[in-house]
Amino acid sequence: QAGPLPKPTLWAEPGSVISWGNSVTIWCQGTLEAREYRLDKEESPAPWDRQNPLEPKNKARFSIPSMTEDYAGRYRCYYRSPVGWSQPSDPLELVMTGAYSKPTLSALPSPLVTSGKSVTLLCQSRSPMDTFLLIKERAAHPLLHLRSEHGAQQHQAEFPMSPVTSVHGGTYRCFSSHGFSHYLLSHPSDPLELIVSGSLEDPRPSPTRSVSTAAGPEDQPLMPTGSVPHSGLRRHWE
């Protein structure tokens, strides 16, 4: 008896974070024996879509011509071969930006910061929100969440970084969202360039919370420390 069919690979092009109205293609890659591909969307009737394989039959394309709220969510795909259906793929989380007006991102006291000092990135929204995300460009794990307790609505979140090192330098944006759908984000804030001056030999910042630092600097770009100041927000690392 052969084992279960290997799970397919699921990905999105040009990426899994898509602005409202833009097109996105979801790809599911299985094996050459695949006869049919099925895409399921969490909390939607299954199957969400079915496609015949493209030659040489080891993958299928699911097209979304114009991204809207309805397409945002968590997807898995399967393929069918002569011996049955495969295991599900790992999930793909398709996120739509542009659902809400853009927040404002500021650096306190300044985006020009000396190594070893402290800086706070402040993300502020017009509408009451319950989740704020800070994203650093070109970082392996770029997301840092602040999520309010008990769904309380907030207009801002503070992301303190201390002590700052050269690792913290770079371009940041923030987003806001509502807890009822983490797949719907605001427009991105305007970019904020954080410039760190000082010694190149700075030690890595040591977090005051249990954050894995086994990865290299670009895998752990953000090291906020200290408590969240009276905001009712809870910090989440991703």
Partner: antibody, heavy 118, light 107 residues
């Protein structure tokens, strides 16, 4: 609790300059924008502009550029509006207010009355 | 600039009655509107934000609604302490603008 305490009534001569203070207590002063609003007798409320004390970033209503300048002292949790070249048109009540993120103005000072008269 | 046209400019109502004030924006403001109560000798007080969210501690007699360009604010079961001037404020762009105000008197 959050409080915004403004300086008292001022009587100034035309052409002079003056400064109104707004002392904030009960919250992290550096991370909330301070708003300045003008109310002339018989008129409604007019937004002058704002300052984010932690960075000194300011935004001004074009109508008040050259007239109003904002500053803030984070060591004393105090914001200031400096008004220059005063005329009778500047006679008004000036309010400071805290802004919640980029949203509502949730706490206001009691107002400072400025009278410009020769 | 976004203009906020508030009406009426004044109104008189009986104790226990209901009043409604409206604000029309010159463009869609995406519910980015507040309502404030201003009593003489004091700073304004925030009653409603984001079109319909009641501030903590504000009685449920006060309410707000609307979307797009048109918004309204109501007070039911009028009480003597409701005598004040009421303002709307839009903050959908970098230049917040107030409505002209509505002076509420009790008959």
């Amino acid at each position: 609790q959050v409080q915004m305490q403004q300086s008292g009534t001022e009587l100034m001569k035309p052409g002079a300059s003056m400064k109104i203070s707004c002392k904030a207590t009960g919250y992290t002063f550096s991370t909330y924008w301070i708003q300045w609003i003008k109310q002339r007798p018989g008129h409604g409320l007019e937004w002058i502009g704002e300052i984010l004390p932690g960075s000194g970033t300011t935004n001004y209503n074009e109508n008040f550029k050259g007239k109003a300048t904002f500053s803030a002292d984070t060591s004393s949790n105090t914001a200031y509006i400096h008004l220059s070249s005063l005329t009778s048109e500047d006679s008004a009540v000036f309010y400071c207010a805290r802004r919640l993120g980029r949203g509502p103005f949730d706490y206001w000072g009691q107002g400072t009355t400025l009278t410009v008269s020769s | 600039d976004i203009q906020m046209t508030q009406s009426p400019s004044s109104l008189s109502a009986s104790l226990g009655g209901k009043v409604t004030i409206t604000c029309e924006a010159s463009q869609d403001i995406n519910k980015h509107i507040d309502w404030y109560q201003h009593q003489p000798g004091r700073g304004p007080s925030l009653l409603i934000h984001y079109a319909s969210i009641l501030q903590p501690g504000i009685p449920s007699r006060f309410s707000g609604s609307g979307s797009g360009r048109d918004y309204s604010f109501s007070i039911t079961s009028l009480e003597p302490e409701d005598i004040a001037t009421y303002y709307c404020l839009q903050y959908d762009n970098l230049l917040p603008t107030f409505g002209g105000g509505t002076k509420l008197e009790i008959k």
